[in-house]
Interface confidence: low
């Protein structure tokens, strides 16, 4: 067969769908690989062909579009399952071609089973809500295109196993779920089940996401350096190990990059010749506030090193701060010579 631009297996788009539910999967060519859309391709005389490789097989097979009730069908650049079966799991390929042009990409599709509490191996999207921040909403995800706007689905929301009704601060509003004053106790998995009719059949779409309650921007502060501080002096003798922790608290800020770094005499440690190592550890509070500790270590400190300036710097979207460590050379204790006079002259 003639050459085809093969984009390979697009593992970035590991698609997971629930067993026995409808699934609509768009050919990734038009979304991520080609600079034109399906309509343009179709009007230029290009044909979209689908085939698949079953799980644990090497053989590429055509997709059977003649199953009862059109269980699998193609509409424009979308492959439809109404509904999926467990053995639909495999690698699916969409190929766009005519006599002179060919481009194809494969992607993995995994059909996943869920239990009665919606637990499954599905990777869940995480939605962050600010703590005690007012009304915030999550929306039932990835349900667009399954039914026309004239169809009014029923939507039921669950937290874990429990249907959400008469919850103190969580209110279902159709496709939205409203949280009033989100609290840590609202952390958990939330599931919307969308039920809609189609051609005399009833279909269910199950979508689960994880809600994580995080620090509110109302309470966010610039980074706070707890150490070094004015109360601790790092007093060392030459030859000893110098260890200075820089401990910084960062308020949670959505999409903020938290940075901590040391400078020695105004330079980054990499830019100076002394043998210095930096070890970093990170811990998080329940609301994802972050504490970063960077320990600056010089194994055998010299008297020159003890005269240098060691400054800890921190930066977040809220601001930048710096604090110098108090480092000094230990003054040797004076040696007292004790002379004992033994013979007291007797008169």
């Amino acid at each position: 067969s003639e050459r085809c631009d093969d984009w390979g297996l697009d593992t970035m788009r590991q698609i997971q769908v629930f067993e026995d539910e409808p699934a609509r999967i768009k050919c990734p060519l038009f979304e991520h690989f080609l600079k034109f859309n399906y309509s343009t391709a179709h009007s230029a005389g290009l044909t979209l062909i689908w085939y698949w490789t079953r799980q644990d097989r090497d053989l590429e097979e055509p997709i059977n579009f003649r199953l009862p009730e059109n269980r699998i069908s193609k509409e424009k650049d979308v492959l439809w399952f109404r509904p999926t079966l467990l053995n639909d799991t495999g690698n699916y390929t969409c190929m766009l071609r005519n006599t002179t042009y060919c481009s194809k990409v494969a992607f993995p599709l995994e059909v996943v089973q869920k239990d009665s509490c919606f637990n499954s191996p599905m990777k869940l999207p995480v939605h962050k809500l600010y703590i005690e921040y007012g009304i915030q909403r999550i929306t039932c995800p990835n349900v667009d295109g399954y039914f026309p706007s004239s169809v009014k689905p029923t939507i039921t929301w669950y937290m874990g196993c429990y249907k959400i009704q008469n919850f103190n601060n969580v209110i279902p509003e159709g496709m939205n779920l409203s949280f009033l004053i989100a609290l840590i106790s609202n952390n958990g998995n939330y599931t919307c089940v969308v039920t809609y009719p189609e051609n005399g059949r009833t279909f269910h779409l199950t979508r689960t996401l994880t809600v994580k309650v995080v620090g509110s921007p109302k309470n966010a502060v610039p980074p706070v350096i707890h150490s070094p501080n004015d109360h601790v002096v790092y007093e060392k003798e030459p030859g000893e190990e110098l260890l200075i922790p820089c401990t910084v608290y960062f308020s949670f800020l959505m999409d903020s990059r938290n940075e901590v770094w040391w400078t020695i005499d105004g330079k980054k440690p990499d830019d100076i010749t002394i043998d210095v190592t930096i070890n970093e550890s990170i811990s998080h509070s329940r609301t994802e506030d972050e504490t970063r500790t960077q320990i600056l270590s010089i194994k055998k400190v010299t008297s020159e090193d003890l005269k240098r300036s060691y400054v800890c710097h921190a930066r977040s979207a809220k601001g930048e701060v710096a604090k110098a460590a108090k480092v000094k050379q230990k003054v040797p204790a004076p040696r007292y010579t004790v002379e004992l006079a033994c013979g007291f002259g007797a008169t």
Epitope: G134, R137, G174, N176
Partner: antibody, heavy 120, light 108 residues
Framework: EVQLEESGGRLVQPGGSLRLSCAVS????????MSWVRQAPGKGLEWVST???????AYASWPKGRFTISRDNSKNTLYLQMNSLRAEDTAVYFC??????????????WGQGTLVTVSS | DIQMTQSPSSLSASVGDRVTITCQAS??????LSWYQQKPGQAPKLLIY???DLESGVPSRFSGSGSGTDFTLTISSLQPEDFATYYC??????????FGQGTKVVIK
Amino acid sequence: EVQLEESGGRLVQPGGSLRLSCAVSGFSLSSYDMSWVRQAPGKGLEWVSTIYIGGTTAYASWPKGRFTISRDNSKNTLYLQMNSLRAEDTAVYFCARLQGANYYNSLALWGQGTLVTVSS
Amino acid sequence: DIQMTQSPSSLSASVGDRVTITCQASQSIYSFLSWYQQKPGQAPKLLIYAASDLESGVPSRFSGSGSGTDFTLTISSLQPEDFATYYCQCNYIIDYGAFGQGTKVVIK
């Protein structure tokens, strides 16, 4: 410019019906929660009803099914259908936009109001 | 339903005075409370939301405090344009929107 403009207020007899409209401009009605608030002559503000983005509606306890809030997103218009009107429904009716999806349900933008008079 | 009780119902004050208006909810509403100012013949104007957050464009002499059931609106130094009626409103839970009965601030 972002604004709300109420219309439809007039003199109506007790037992009659009226539909108030609130035309919004400068923003998309479908993206905001909206409320109706009324104020009887010389009296305080009284919340009537709210329609949320998701379509959920909420009412004060006193209309007891006589009032219905709705919206037409394609016309960018909010409505209040008032049936079985009583003399005590006489008031200026304001429509108001709530602050935004992730805020505290405050009424941040108000129209100038339309006067409904119920009298025989 | 939640009831909102505002006090005083009216107060007379002079320009430059510090004015305090209180609002009490019949049950905890966390910080779901707004304050509005209304002048005769005009629509109300949002001053404070979330009990203490100043709406943009509102002068900093207005401040709000409180949470749970007890809330306060303070005008630190009354200006001539501040003579108006002030309302608190409960914003907690989707089916509550009750207003306080209003506090009229008049010139002494």
